[in-house]
């Protein structure tokens, strides 16, 4: 366009500004030794200062550590930004009972209502179950469903919440790592190679490129590259791919240039804690009691219900192994979620009844 | 295995410059920040800064913002420090380190050290 | 910048007791704390970071604790390899910053 030529000339004239051919403006070029904070900087507020991956530039333009998210009752809520820490919250299933800068010390398991009340308000990350007497006339065992909910986020059955966390963990700080590796890894959706640059289950700025370096001048191709075993997010981020290296794991789909790698739990499993793009637990297909049968759905976004076969059908399920190893299932990823409305619970021959949940997806 | 090559000791005279390199080998050079850090004899441990070897970016400690100059050769892997103006104070064993990952896991691999000696 | 403190610049021990090194930050790290072991003419040593998480091939007799301003590293039965300087790190804000050290010597 013609009337961008003069603007042009003038932006190579001034030797603090340089032409963007890509938004066809003139834009401030940072100092040596700072970044901008958006593709064509205006001034000099718009640059800053560069830390490593997994660190965040505070207030006081200190390179701080993000908060890690790798102890297994942990997840990541938001990711380490350049400008913010990573933020963790319990998993699902539990709650914060002591909280820590961006983190929390202590998650507990969410209280299972007992006999004789219902849930009032389901357990989030932050709060445990509330529970209320059940209406006049409702007995323990639930005359209608309307008026005998499972708590949302159940598990195995707690009398009180019960701790999982280190009890080294302290209020103001963030927590210790804990936990076995498989946890961890489970906790943290990502594992990483012992030698790895990746941060376990969370994007990481790319350690060459600016997020926000804007496109070299005169080049034609301004897609930002990103390392081997990490892929362009929606956000410009290079983000690691999932890794499918957990021996329950199956890679389902391959780590591309613009979208993760996706695992899915190894024939003979089913997923039972979804992960983005994996898989956090996957235990073996169940075996259906007598008088239960699946119901297949659509792998593990979907929950899973159980329902009594037709009258004259054998249940459509395999016995046994003599080994104890579950039967190979032929949707490897089906989700082992119950409809936490129903008030069911898995016929997993256990000594306690497991509900699972799927609303901490 | 990841391995962190330094030059060899350096004697100096006050007012005068050194130059030393650290070769890194076993995992991509530009994928890591490479810090350097100094020892005085019988003393403790400074972090004098690091330098991203993929774009060139560094970050110094204040203390040191006037005395070391960072650089990298992506071609040769290999990332330099210049200490300029030498004194006595700068008589120390200088290591070129890398972290283990970075998931916060710190410093994990260390160069043999570079021995500056100043002395009239 | 984050102050680095070890109150003990030397620890007399002897080998099977059990050690317990200190070190306190200036300011709140978020247990982003790290302790390196270095023997006379050779590099530092990564044993501990995040206050309590054990580097790769280190024994684990050595433990690390602690949390906020306050950080402990424990040698539960000491070896006569284990006679070193030990010195602690924040990792947690730049510029990153070193305790002054303590040597574990032979009683």
């Known amino acids: 366009f013609p009337q961008d030529r003069p603007f042009e000339d003038t932006c190579h004239g001034n030797p603090s500004h340089y032409y963007d051919k890509a938004v066809r403006r003139c834009c401030y070029r940072c100092p040596m030794g700072l970044f901008p904070t958006q593709q064509c900087p205006q001034r000099p507020t718009d640059c800053r200062k560069q830390c490593e991956p997994d660190y965040y530039l505070d207030e006081a333009d200190r390179c701080t550590a993000c908060v890690t998210c790798s102890r297994d009752d942990l997840v990541e809520k938001t990711p380490c930004a350049w400008n913010s820490s990573r933020v963790c919250e319990c998993r699902p299933g539990m709650f914060c009972s002591t909280s820590a800068v961006n983190s929390c010390a202590r998650c507990f398991f969410h209280s299972v209502c007992p006999a004789g009340m219902i849930v009032k308000f389901p357990g989030t990350a932050q709060k445990n179950t509330v529970c209320e007497p059940a209406s006049p006339g409702v007995s323990p065992a639930c005359a209608s469903p309307e008026n005998c909910k499972e708590p949302s986020s159940g598990t195995i059955p707690q009398a009180k919440p019960t701790p999982v966390s280190p009890a080294t963990s302290s209020a103001s700080t963030m927590p210790v790592r804990g936990g076995t590796r498989l946890a961890q890894e489970a906790a943290s959706k990502l594992t990483r190679a012992p030698d790895s640059p990746s941060s376990v289950g969370r994007p990481s700025s790319d350690p060459g490129l600016s997020p926000t370096q804007p496109c070299p001048e005169g080049s034609g191709d301004c897609r930002k590259q990103c390392e081997p075993d990490y892929y362009l997010d929606e956000a410009g981020r290079c983000t690691a791919c999932v890794s499918c290296s957990r021996d329950d794991l199956v890679e389902k789909t391959p780590c591309a240039w613009n979208s993760s790698r996706t695992c899915e739990c190894r024939p003979g499993m089913i997923c039972a804690t979804s992960a983005t793009n994996s898989c956090a637990r996957c235990v073996p297909y169940p075996i259906c009691a007598a008088e239960t049968v699946t119901k297949p759905q659509d792998m593990a976004e979907k929950d899973t219900t159980f329902e009594a076969p037709p009258l004259g059908t054998q249940p459509d399920c395999n016995p046994t192994p003599e080994n104890g190893e579950a039967p190979a299932s032929t949707s490897p990823t089906q989700s082992l979620l119950v409809d936490s409305q129903a008030s069911k619970t898995l016929p997993i021959p256990t000594s306690a009844p497991v509900a699972l949940s799927s609303t901490g997806k | 295995q990841v391995q962190l090559q330094q030059s060899g000791a350096e004697l100096a005279k006050p007012g005068a410059s050194v130059k030393m390199s650290c070769k890194a080998s076993?995992?991509?050079?530009?994928?890591?920040?490479m810090h350097w850090v100094k020892q005085r004899p019988g003393q403790g441990l400074e972090w004098i800064g690091y330098?991203?070897?993929?774009?060139?970016?560094?970050d110094y400690n204040e203390k040191f913002k006037d005395k070391a100059t960072l650089t990298a050769d992506k071609s040769s892997s290999t990332a330099y420090m210049q200490l300029s103006s030498l004194t006595s104070e700068d008589s120390a064993v200088y290591y070129c380190?890398?972290?283990?990952?970075?998931?916060?896991?710190?410093?994990?691999?260390w160069g043999q050290g570079t021995l500056v000696s100043v002395s009239a | 910048d984050i102050v680095m403190t070890q109150s003990h610049k030397f620890m007399s021990t002897s080998v099977g007791d059990r050690v317990t090194i200190t070190c306190k930050a200036s300011?709140?790290?978020?247990?982003?704390v790290a302790w390196y072991q270095q023997k006379p003419g050779h590099s530092p040593k990564l044993l501990i970071y995040?206050?309590?998480t054990r580097h790769t091939g280190v024994p684990d007799r050595f433990t690390g604790s602690g949390s906020g301003t306050d950080y402990t590293l424990t040698i539960s039965s000491v070896q006569v390899e284990d006679l070193a300087l030990y010195y602690c790190?924040?990792?947690?804000?730049?510029?990153?910053?070193f305790g002054s050290g303590t040597k574990l010597e032979i009683k």
């Open positions: 380190v890398r972290r283990g990952s970075y998931d916060g896991n710190p410093f994990a691999y």
């Open positions: 076993g995992y991509t050079f530009t994928t890591y920040w």
């Open positions: 330098i991203n070897p993929s774009t060139g970016y560094t």
């Open positions: 300011q709140d790290v978020s247990t982003a």
């Open positions: 995040w206050a309590s």
């Open positions: 790190q924040q990792h947690y804000s730049t510029p990153f910053t």
